[in-house]
């Protein structure tokens, strides 16, 4: 006996479609070998019609496909627009030739069955409603009107004009007449289910003079839309259920064997597996909404259904829309860490991937918030200014062309822990989710700035030093001036950085920044950081206040960031002077200036503005220098 298994017989009608599932034994070879569907001829030859190698015969062109599901050890042959010519004997099988392992399938396609010649066909989707029109002669106007459903032996009453209603149609069936027209009555049936499909007879009057009409009601389940997405990419389910359910709660659920498990609904329910990577967005008053899922995983593949009901849960007889989601593991989206860990007072540098073909797209970083339907307010973007509460501690560095931009967040607190999204206004598949975890710091920070009291005096020279540990010895050190449009890296003279050393004195590694002479424009946040090429590492921030010279002035720290700085050892520094003044740039309102939220993320308008480099938006000229002290013992 063959180890391949499937349906021995399949019967259908012209114009319909079939999905034939063939099961194969669970082995690696079987999962990867060629799958085929062939038709057996009188000579015993089996002619390939379609195979998993991409072959498709002329007679199947545009109406058939073959999909392998290695995770289930099955493959499916879908054939549409059947004709009686498709009747015959077939094989589904595995192997490089059609003489491999196979299973015989008999397909029979019949003519569409004849309905009584006067039958009116109504075709409706599940959950919708139908209004059946029943004409009658004027002499039957005073008589009883009724609609019944044909069963094997009889015709079972659905509803009549004496207000009799079948129990399974209570609250769903209405018999009525419109205006003064006495030649037609109507029956409306709402919340249609599969069980409502069948033949009906509407009747006015009794006996031989009665008016009768045959009705065929077809109730269709929606065809699932096939969605093919890459691992780690994102998917948007666009759900359009119609105006009649506009005011009902909406949901998205995933089918499992027995039920459809709700993943998210507009009543606040959310599956923990989707925490941080899902949003539900009501679109308009017509019952349209969308659900966005980012960071797709292998296990997200499956059959999804959206719907509407006051309970926020799937309910028979309510409109639905369905999708089959396939997640391709051979993804174009690079595998990045999905969890980034930081410590209080420290910093994180998050590398966000984007489609390298869209280097000029606008880049954004938003924080996912799970309250309500979930939303993702933008915190920073290439043309979106940093949100006020992140002043001095958040910047986006765009590295055009290499498919990555970096977001740096420093002065971390435990409040910063949560989920963040990287996204652009271009290819929406490249939306990625990062979970930021923040632990309490248990040791001194790696980077420390001195002096702690960073108050510079107008017209004078002011130097700040950034101390770094030996482990950062070979990395590039930099200072940058922060503005709400980025952190502009200052030119530096890196002295002695390339010379080799026998040992590294932990206390004497530093990079300094000198402001000479200090101007009012120098006031603000400065960052000291390390990087290796385009890969950014740790940073620390300091606020430099600028004030006029006054006798006996006492300085107050403007922020608690400086309070966290540690007093450093006295070290020799190399000065470098600055004479250029900062170019004032007019702030450019970001694309989400009015409503800084990614909600209709699928609908983001393409920006017409050219993308600005957040790392150089400031046009400032300042400098920093570093000196390495080498001690030989």
């Amino acid at each position: 006996k063959s180890p391949i298994f499937g349906p021995q017989e399949v019967s259908s009608i012209e114009g319909d479609s079939v999905s034939i599932t063939c099961y194969y034994p669970d082995t690696s070879v079987n999962r990867h070998t060629r799958k085929y569907w062939c038709r057996q001829g009188a000579s015993g030859m089996c002619t390939t019609l379609i195979s998993s190698n991409g072959y498709l015969s002329k007679e199947y062109s545009g109406r058939a496909n073959l999909i392998n599901f290695p995770e289930n050890n099955t493959f499916v042959i879908n054939i549409e627009q059947l004709t009686q010519d498709d009747t015959g004997s077939y094989k589904c099988g595995l192997g490089t030739s059609n003489r491999g392992l196979s299973f015989d399938v008999s397909l029979e396609v019949s003519q569409v069955p004849e309905l009584p010649s006067d039958t009116h066909v109504y075709t409706k989707d599940i959950g919708r409603n139908v209004t059946i029109e029943c004409p009658f002669k004027r002499e039957n106007a005073p008589s009883k009107k009724s609609l019944c459903k044909k069963t094997n032996q009889s015709c079972e009453l659905v509803i009549d004009s004496t207000e009799k209603v079948n129990p399974s149609y209570i609250g769903r069936a209405k018999l009525f007449m419109k205006g003064t027209d006495l030649t037609v009555f109507y029956v409306n049936i709402s919340h249609l289910t599969h069980n409502d499909a069948g033949l009906y007879i509407c009747q006015a009057g009794e006996g031989p003079s009665a008016d009768k009409k045959n009705v065929d009601l077809q109730v269709l389940a929606p065809e699932p839309e096939l969605l093919y997405k890459d691992l780690r990419s994102s998917v948007t389910f666009e759900c359009d259920l119609g105006r009649e359910v506009a005011n009902e709660a909406k949901y998205l659920c995933r089918m499992n064997k027995e039920t459809c498990d709700v993943i998210i609904n507009t009543l606040g329910k959310r599956d923990p597996d989707f925490e941080g990577r899902i949003l539900i967005t009501p679109k308009d008053d017509n019952g349209r909404f969308s659900v966005l899922i980012t960071g797709l995983r292998k296990e997200d593949a499956g059959h999804y259904q959206c719907g509407a009901h006051s309970s926020g849960l799937p309910q028979e007889g309510w409109p639905i829309q369905t999708w089959q989601l396939f997640v391709n593991e051979e993804s174009t989206i690079p595998n990045r860490r999905s969890v980034v860990k930081g410590v209080t007072g420290g910093s994180v540098a998050i590398a966000c991937p984007y489609n390298p073909k869209e280097s000029s797209s606008l880049k954004y970083w938003c924080r996912w918030e799970g309250d309500g339907n979930g939303h993702c307010p933008v915190l920073v973007g290439t043309q979106a200014q940093v949100q006020e509460e992140y002043e001095g501690r958040l910047a986006l560095f765009d590295q055009p062309g290499n498919g990555t931009y970096t977001v740096i967040l420093n002065q971390l607190t435990t409040e910063d822990a949560g989920f963040y999204w990287c996204l652009t206004n271009g290819d929406s598949r490249w939306r990625t989710t990062i979970e930021l975890q923040v632990a309490e710091a248990t040791r001194e920070p790696n980077l420390e700035v001195t002096p702690q009291n960073a108050t510079a005096v107008l017209g004078e020279t002011f130097t700040v030093s950034c101390h770094y540990p030996c482990k950062f010895y070979s990395q590039e050190k930099y200072w940058c001036k922060w503005s709400n449009k980025g952190c502009h890296i200052l030119p530096s003279h890196d002295e002695g950085a390339r010379q080799s050393s026998v040992s590294c004195d932990q206390s004497s590694q530093l990079v300094s920044m000198t402001l000479n002479p200090v101007s009012k424009e120098d006031e603000g946040w400065y960052w000291c950081g390390v990087k290796q090429g385009q890969t950014y590492g740790e940073t620390t921030a300091i606020y430099i206040a600028v004030e006029e010279r006054t006798r006996g002035s006492s300085h107050v720290n403007p922020t608690d960031a400086n309070a966290r700085a540690k007093v450093a050892l006295e070290e020799e520094v190399v000065d470098s002077s600055i004479s250029e003044k900062e170019n004032k740039a007019i702030p450019n309102p970001g694309p989400f200036a009015n409503e800084r939220e990614i909600q209709n993320v699928g609908d983001q308008a393409q920006e017409n503005r050219a993308s600005g480099d957040a790392g150089s938006a400031d046009g400032q000229s300042r400098s920093s220098s570093s000196k390495h002290h080498h001690h030989h013992h």
Partner: nanobody
Amino acid sequence: EVQLVESGGGLVQAGGSLRLSCAASGRTFSSDAVGWFRQAPGKEREFVAHIHWSGDFTTYYYYGDFVKGRFTISRGTAKNTVYLQMNSLKPEDTAVYYCAAPKGAIGDPRSTREYDYWGQGTLVTVSS
């Protein structure tokens, strides 16, 4: 609550025929698939046949290896009844025959794990 009730079992001579019925009741029964299994004394439950319908006009018929054209599974015009027509019966067909239905979509129809509702069974005895 969904209930499946089998009927039509009994004693029959080898070479004879029987027609088993499986009737589903309960408001929530909306399965589009029904399977037949059998269990002979001291043996494991074994797959006999499965029918799956898609819409009004497309039907898929699956059979166990031993059937070899002797049995036919079909659906009654009332959508809640499924029949198993058994011809050319052999003594080794003696067993309790069960019908089963899944709540939703089904994987491999041969696996008992795929079915959620089971009938009490009907005994078929084939004498030689």
